[in-house]
Interface confidence: medium
């Protein structure tokens, strides 16, 4: 078992109201018909994506304001990789293959995206950060 994610001491997280009504396996949290896993160790963006895929998931695809707010709360002050990346000569793409449609602003000038409770930004993909996976309910 990878264990549960320990939120930083300076941040309090309340479980969303629908989190208990889920079809998610142990160590995963259900929200808005998706299962989420928040890592307890740090990896590069690519290694994190590989870790997600081993569980039939991808780095988190954020496709609604509710999801965004949920993940920012969950991430707290720590930086977490999510599934948005820009390959040279290509548009920003989510880890599910969808082109990003600029519905939120990504700061920074690097190629891989992370979030924390106050921002969504980009960083060099080789940096080791916590990460968030998601996949649809079974």
């Amino acid at each position: 078992s990878v264990g549960q994610y320990n939120c930083p001491g300076q941040y309090t997280f309340s479980m969303p109201s629908d989190s208990h009504v889920s079809s998610c396996s142990e160590d995963w949290v259900g929200y808005q018909r998706k299962c989420y896993f928040i890592s307890t160790v740090k990896r590069s963006w690519t290694s994190a994506q590989n870790a997600c895929s081993e569980h039939g998931a991808t780095l988190a695809v954020i496709d609604s304001e509710k999801d965004m707010n949920f993940l920012k709360r969950y991430a707290g002050r720590e930086e977490h990789w999510v599934g948005l990346k820009k390959e040279p000569g290509h548009p920003w793409k989510w880890s599910n293959g969808k082109e990003f449609n600029n519905w939120f602003n990504v700061t920074g000038s690097d190629k891989c995206v992370f979030l924390k409770n106050t921002e969504v930004s980009s960083m060099e993909c080789e940096k080791n950060l916590y990460w968030i996976c998601n996949k649809p309910y079974k």
């Epitope: 496709d63 609604s64 304001e65 548009p91 293959g97 969808k98 082109e99 990003f100 449609n101 600029n102 519905w103 602003n105």
Partner: antibody, heavy 106, light 108 residues
Framework: VQPGGSLRLSCAAS????????MHWVRQAPGKGLEWVSS????????YYADSVKGRFTISRDNSKNTLYLQMNSLRAEDTAVYYC??????????WGQGTLVTVSS | DIELTQPPSVSVAPGQTARISCSGD??????VYWYQQKPGQAPVVVIY???KRPSGIPERFSGSNSGNTATLTISGTQAEDEADYYC???????????FGGGTKLTVL
Amino acid sequence: VQPGGSLRLSCAASGFTFSNFVMHWVRQAPGKGLEWVSSISGSSSSTYYADSVKGRFTISRDNSKNTLYLQMNSLRAEDTAVYYCARYYYASFDYWGQGTLVTVSS
Amino acid sequence: DIELTQPPSVSVAPGQTARISCSGDSLGSKYVYWYQQKPGQAPVVVIYGDSKRPSGIPERFSGSNSGNTATLTISGTQAEDEADYYCGSYTTGAKSHVFGGGTKLTVL
């Protein structure tokens, strides 16, 4: 307005934090389909235009007044349409203005 | 840039299922939204993000998108669903947006 003339449209927004959202103008010629016209980022740092209006129309916003603008110059008959302002969020234009009819004719 | 193609009209009997297609090159790699527009009114989004339904939109509206085709499905079509329907998406880099030509849905 007559061909070659100018006009400025405004769109007053309320009920949400205006500066946080990308805003767009979309138009619809009488009896025709929807046509995207222009967009502007929340901070006004990025603006984009359809080829059909590039160089003639200018989109802007005043976040202190929660207002979106479209300055239309060198108007043509084919610019005749109902112009809608619309908020863009996640993956759709989720809120639309009621529309303003602009008629360009001599 | 991407072009979206819709059938000009679709007819369906009340209670039956209506399907409206929207095709474009590699459309499945982008998110698609669908609007309903009734005469004299502004468009209303009925599906966004390929298949998500805004609150207040009846469950009979659903959407899908894969390959080169997105589809709006209205199950158990009602007379009030008679309207023009437009699909929409965005170009690479989301620097512009494009709409299909619209489909007039007639409930017989």
